[in-house]
Every structure is written in C-alpha cells, then in structure tokens.
C-alpha cells in the first residue's frame, strides 16, 4: 500500500541518507509536523534538524546551479576574448616583424638608427590596445615629431642642430607635412581600428566580469525558504515522488533571481553594441586591414620624407634660419634609395570572418541569459513534473498550481506568492554591474562612431568598483609622451591578464 510505505518514512530515509546526512535523524514513521518552520505542518517524516539541513542543502544546490550556468557563460566569453585578443595581437606583431625584417634593407641607417622609435611606437600601440589610458592621436603625433627630428639630423649630418633649432623644426612640422599623407591617413585609420578592436575585446571582458560578480551575489533568506519548500517539502510531507509544478518553480526562481533579471536590458544593449561594432572590422579602415599594415604607412612616410627632402630643407631654413655648418662634418647625405613598399591591403586571412561569425552566433544565444535563467534552472536542475497539472507538487500538496507566473525583474515581484521580495531594496552589487554594462555600451557606441571615450573618466560615472639618425643604433627618436601628463596605468577593464607590466621586455 503506497500510503503505508510513505507513512513508514522509508523513501525519505533513502533520499536523506543519499545526501550524506545521518540516518539517525530520520523518524521510523511519520510524526506530527507542528515543529516545521518552512514546510506545511501536516504529518511529516522530517524533524526540525532535518528541515534545517535540507533547507541549507537546497540553498547550496541552487547557488551551485547558478554558478554552473554562469561558469558556462564565462567560459564562452573568456574563449572569445582569448581568440580575438590573440588575433589582434598577432596582426600587430606580424606588422612589427615585417618592419624589422624589411626596413633595414629598404632604408638602411634611416631605419637602424631609429629602430627604437619604431619599437616604442608598436609598444605604445600594444599598450593602447590593452586598455592603457593614453591618447592614441597624441601618441602618433609625438612619434612623427620625434622621427622628423631624428631623420632631419640624419639627413643633414653637416649641420649643427642645437635644441632651439630642433624646437623650431618641430613647430614648423605641421605646416610642412614632411611625411606626406601617411601620418594623417594612419591617424584616421588607426584610431578607428584600434578603438574598435580594443572596445570589442574590453566588451567581452566586461561581460565576463559582470557574470562572475553577479554569480557571487548571495541568495537571501526568503529565497532559501522558498527553494526548500519547492525542492524538499514534498519529501517531508510524504509525497516524495511529486515533482514541482513548472509554474510554481518559475515563480520561486523569478523571485529569487529578481535582481539578476534587471540586468536584462543593459545586457542586451551591450551584446547588441558588440555585434554592431564587428562591422568596423572590415574594409580599408577595418581592424584587419589597418592593424596588420601599420608598417606600410611607416614605409610610405619615410619615402615621402626622402622625396621631399630638398623642399623641406629649404622651407625649414626659411622658417628657422640658416643653421651653422660643422666644418669637420661631411657634405649632405646622398639621396637614399626608396624603400620598396609592400601592398597596403592585407588579403583577409579568413580567420577574423570565422571568429566574428562564431562570436555573433554565441552572443545572440546568450542575449536572454538573465531572464531565461529561472526557466533554464527549473527545466535543467529542478526535475520538473511532466505529468498533468493536478499531479505535481504545488508547495502545499500534490495538485494544480493556480497562481499566475510573475513577470521578470524586481518590480514585477511585488505580488509574488512564493517569495517575499522587497522591491524597494535592489541589490547594490547588481546595480553596480548594470552601471558597468551601461558604461561599456556607451564606449562601444562611441567606438562605432570612431571616437574613443576616456575609459577612466567613464568608469567613474557611478559604480564605484568596476568590476608606462638621431643617435643610438635603434635608440633615437623614441616616442615617449612628453606632453601628456597622464600616467599610463591599466584601466578598470584593461584586458584581463594583460597588465601594463607585461610591456616589459629587454632588447
């Protein structure tokens, strides 16, 4: 007889023991349930201690299920981040390797005496991409200024060029356009490309960070009670075979995860913005085309300077006066050979297209992560009833679950029959993460328009915690920011694991 089997508490004993609890706690037969604090107070197989143990266990199980779901999402975002980051860094490293391999032959000492300047430029581009707080346009402008100074000295070894003369040369530079169109073109294209690449990768970092932080938000005591009632009270009340009614489960988890669901709107905005910015990865100003071809703009610039040398010198003398000549110095340098240019457009490798299409698909898949979480957990982790509605566990007994399913988010839980939710007290950690999502979305939208938003300024917006032949062979003309006093520190969302210190290397 099933009723007598239930009354003997055998099934409860089995389930309770399987969870690792001591069987000595379990009564042999049902007892009166006045002592129960969470489950309905009918006849029961659960003592107070059992109820407390099962309540703690159900709480822990839900937190584990939540963390598991979050971990899957985090892993996906981390894999995406790594893939894109590897690809973008590879493009820049390839460009630098090509420069180091081809420039000595193409430009001789015009390159070797200034190799340090080029190395520094690539280092700064790397730092910028990784999220350092430096101004890319200024970095490029200073690079060209230093390079002009060094190359001008190299091209005129017979002249005495003291600091004040070089200062004058620097002031004339913008009007003289000594490097032709290359600096302007590189500035326009590189700014757009690097801003797009770095903001996309930072977006993945922020998304992952948000998921990690939200997964650590503890479930409140009201949620714990409701989850116990949902999962284990049927056992205590002698109907261990009854599985939770689907709508009942949804209401419990919508109440428990009300704050998390409030991430939905800004989460969608962020993912939409990330998908949108991938449009900027293509074309002549696209990430692949530009980041992989920095060296060709540099080659073009040196060629332009050589072609314009005589005109440039005449204009500099006109603006800055006749410099003194070193009587022991040689004559002016012979015109050097033009560096042979590699084609500017890198043929697309197909790698980026594949990465982008995978990313778009995966980002679309997780767009409704936060609002679908209650449904997902109910169907995947809670062993819901598939029986007809009147045979499932409704929190009181086996039978139909009548209340309507609540809407998503905190405000909609005002009348949640299963979890008492104080809608006037939103969770502060989750509010902070909503702010982080907003900030990153704004950054991506600016990046889409080719603008860089100072990341540190942005992250102060509200949340608190968001989630460094001119002379020496390859020494001269080092582009290091003179004008900007900003110290180049990693930002709130500089790429995870890529701190500024990684820039350290020895030549």
């Amino acid at each position: 007889d099933p009723a007598s089997k239930s009354r003997s508490c055998g099934e409860v004993r089995q389930i309770y023991g399987a969870k690792g609890f001591s069987l000595s706690d379990v009564p042999q037969a049902e007892i009166s349930g006045e002592h129960l604090r969470i489950c309905p107070q009918g006849y029961t197989c659960c003592t107070s201690e059992m109820e407390e143990n099962l309540a703690n266990r159900s709480h822990a199980e839900l937190e584990t299920a939540l963390r598991d779901s979050s971990r899957v999402l985090q892993a996906m975002l981390a894999t995406q981040l790594r893939s894109f980051d590897d690809h973008f860094q590879h493009l820049l490293n390839d460009s630098e390797r090509t420069l180091q391999a081809t420039f000595p032959g193409a430009f001789g000492e015009l390159y070797t005496q200034n190799a340090r300047a080029f190395r520094d430029l690539y280092s700064e581009l790397r730092l910028y991409y990784r999220g350092a707080n430096l101004h890319l346009e200024e970095t490029l402008a200073e690079f060209w200024a230093r390079l002009l100074e060094r190359l001008f000295k190299q091209l005129h070894p017979q002249l005495l060029l003291p600091d004040d003369y070089l200062d004058c040369l620097g002031k004339q530079a913008e009007a003289l356009r000594p490097f032709g169109e290359a600096p302007r073109e590189l500035r326009l294209r590189a700014t757009r490309a690097f801003v797009a690449a770095r903001s996309f990768v930072q977006g993945l970092g922020v998304a992952s960070d948000v998921v990690r932080k939200v997964a650590q938000v503890p479930l409140g005591p009201e949620c714990s009670r409701a989850v116990m009632k949902l999962v284990y009270c049927a056992h205590c009340l002698g109907v261990p075979g009854a599985r939770p009614c689907p709508d009942y489960c949804r209401n419990v988890l919508k109440g428990c995860l009300a704050n998390q669901a409030d991430l939905d709107a800004e989460w969608r905005n962020l993912l939409d913005s990330m998908v949108l910015i991938t449009d900027k990865f293509w074309g002549t100003s696209g990430v692949e085309s530009v980041i992989g071809s920095v060296h060709t703009w540099l080659a073009e610039a040196i060629n332009a300077l050589q072609d314009n040398r005589d005109t440039l010198t005449a204009k500099v003398i006109q603006g800055c006066g006749n410099p003194k000549v070193n009587p022991q110095g040689p004559g002016p340098e012979e015109k050097r050979r033009r560096g042979k240019l590699a084609p500017r457009e890198r043929p697309p490798s197909g790698t980026l297209e594949k990465l982008v299409s995978e990313a778009k698909a995966q980002l679309r898949d997780v767009q409704d992560f936060w609002i679908s979480l209650p449904g997902t957990l109910c169907s995947e982790k809670m062993a819901l009833s598939t029986a007809s509605d009147d045979r499932c566990w409704n929190g009181m007994a086996r039978g139909r679950y009548l209340p309507e399913v609540m809407g998503d988010g905190l405000a909609n839980q005002i009348n949640n029959p299963e979890v008492e939710v104080d809608i006037t007290k939103p969770d502060m950690t989750i509010r902070q993460q909503i702010m982080q999502l907003k900030i990153m979305t704004n950054r991506l939208r600016s990046a889409y328009n080719g603008n860089d938003v100072d990341f540190q300024d942005a992250s102060d917006d509200g949340s608190g915690s968001g989630s460094g032949d001119g002379c020496l062979d390859d020494l001269c003309s080092r582009k290091v920011s003179r004008k900007s006093s900003s110290s180049r520190t990693p930002l709130t969302h500089a790429l995870p694991g890529l701190s500024e210190q990684e820039g350290q290397k020895t030549s």
Partner: antibody
Amino acid sequence: QVQLVQSGAEVKKPGASVKVSCKASGYTFTGYYMHWVRQAPGQGLEWMGEINPSTGDTTYNQKFKARVTMTRDTSTSTVYMELSSLRSEDTAVYYCAREKRDDGVFAYWGQGTLVTVSS
Amino acid sequence: NIQMTQSPSSLSASVGDRVTITCQASQDISNYLNWYQQRPGKAPQLLIYGASNLERGVPSRFSGSGFGTDFTLTISSVQPEDFATYYCQQAKSYPLTFGGGTKVEIK
C-alpha cells in the same frame, strides 16, 4: 625644475641584491627615457641600461644583463634598478640620468647612491 | 662595442690657459658625441651634446668640435671652477660608452 632624487647609501654582503630608486619630478615622467650609470671608486663612468617609463621597455648593457632589472612605477614617478648576485667589484656610486630629448644625451642626473659590497 | 679613448688622462693647467682634450671613437659615430664635467663627489654635468652644441647655462669658454671618429673639447680660458674630470660619451649605438676621463688639475 627637473629633479631626480635617489635612495640612500646601502651596504650589502656578496651574493645579495640591492634595489636603488630614483624619484623624478618637474616634468612628464613618461616622456623621457631614464638610464642608469655607475662609477666605481676612482674609476670612470659605465652605462648599465635604460628604461622607457611609458612602456616599461628596457635595454641593458650585455655586461649586466643577467643581473640587472630596471622597473618603474608611473603612479609615483619612480624608476628602480635592482642588481643581484653582488660582488665586491660592484661597489660603486649608482646614478640615474634622464635623457635630454630622446637622444642618448644625459642632461639631468640624480645625486648618486653609494652601494658598498663587503663581507 | 664602440671604444672611446680619451687623452690625456690628466693634465695640469693654470687659470687662463687654453685646454684641449681629445676623444677618439673606435668606429664612425657621426656627431653622436657628448661631453660631461664631473667635480669631486658630485654627479656629472652635461657640457656639449651632438659634438659641438653648447648646453644651455654652460659658459661659452667651453666648445666642442669633431665628426666621425675624432673629437675635441676646448676650454678657451680655464677658470678655477673648471678643475674637474671630463668625460666623452658616444650615443650612436648600444651599449652607450664613455671615455676613461681626463682630470684637469691646477698647475
């Protein structure tokens, strides 16, 4: 005005390490390379290496490469030079020196830090 | 490595004398040559950069010349404060190297 202030004198045992600091002020710290030059008692000047405070990139004199590490802290505008496996011949005054304008010309020098290596 | 050879290693002069110090590089260094003065117990001070450019604030009695491998520092009329050690330094290639120094003493 540009100032480079170095840490105080140190006495070390052979085999130990020493870390000398150089705090910069009066200019944009990330704007100029910083070099380290040493001078043994009664001897000439010897270049040890340099660091780009903006990127952290370093170039060392091959002679010291295995033992020297140069780092920087942009938040305090300070560069550091650490020399390990000290021997008696490392007894010297260690100077930090800032470049003039990206050209290997040392226009500004720290006051020097005497490091004595003795058992 | 580029060797820098200074001569003489020391010299004696009286106030008002003209003093010439030479520096020879083991290979062509164009005009990437700098001169420093070091007084006892003090840090070196830049005098001349780029072989012949006078650093701001340095008296005009100091001058530099040369190109390629041979360079000269001249003090046209030595003053009491000029008695010190002088070093040349090449800034053409790594490692940066200094000459052995020339000590200018009072006769």
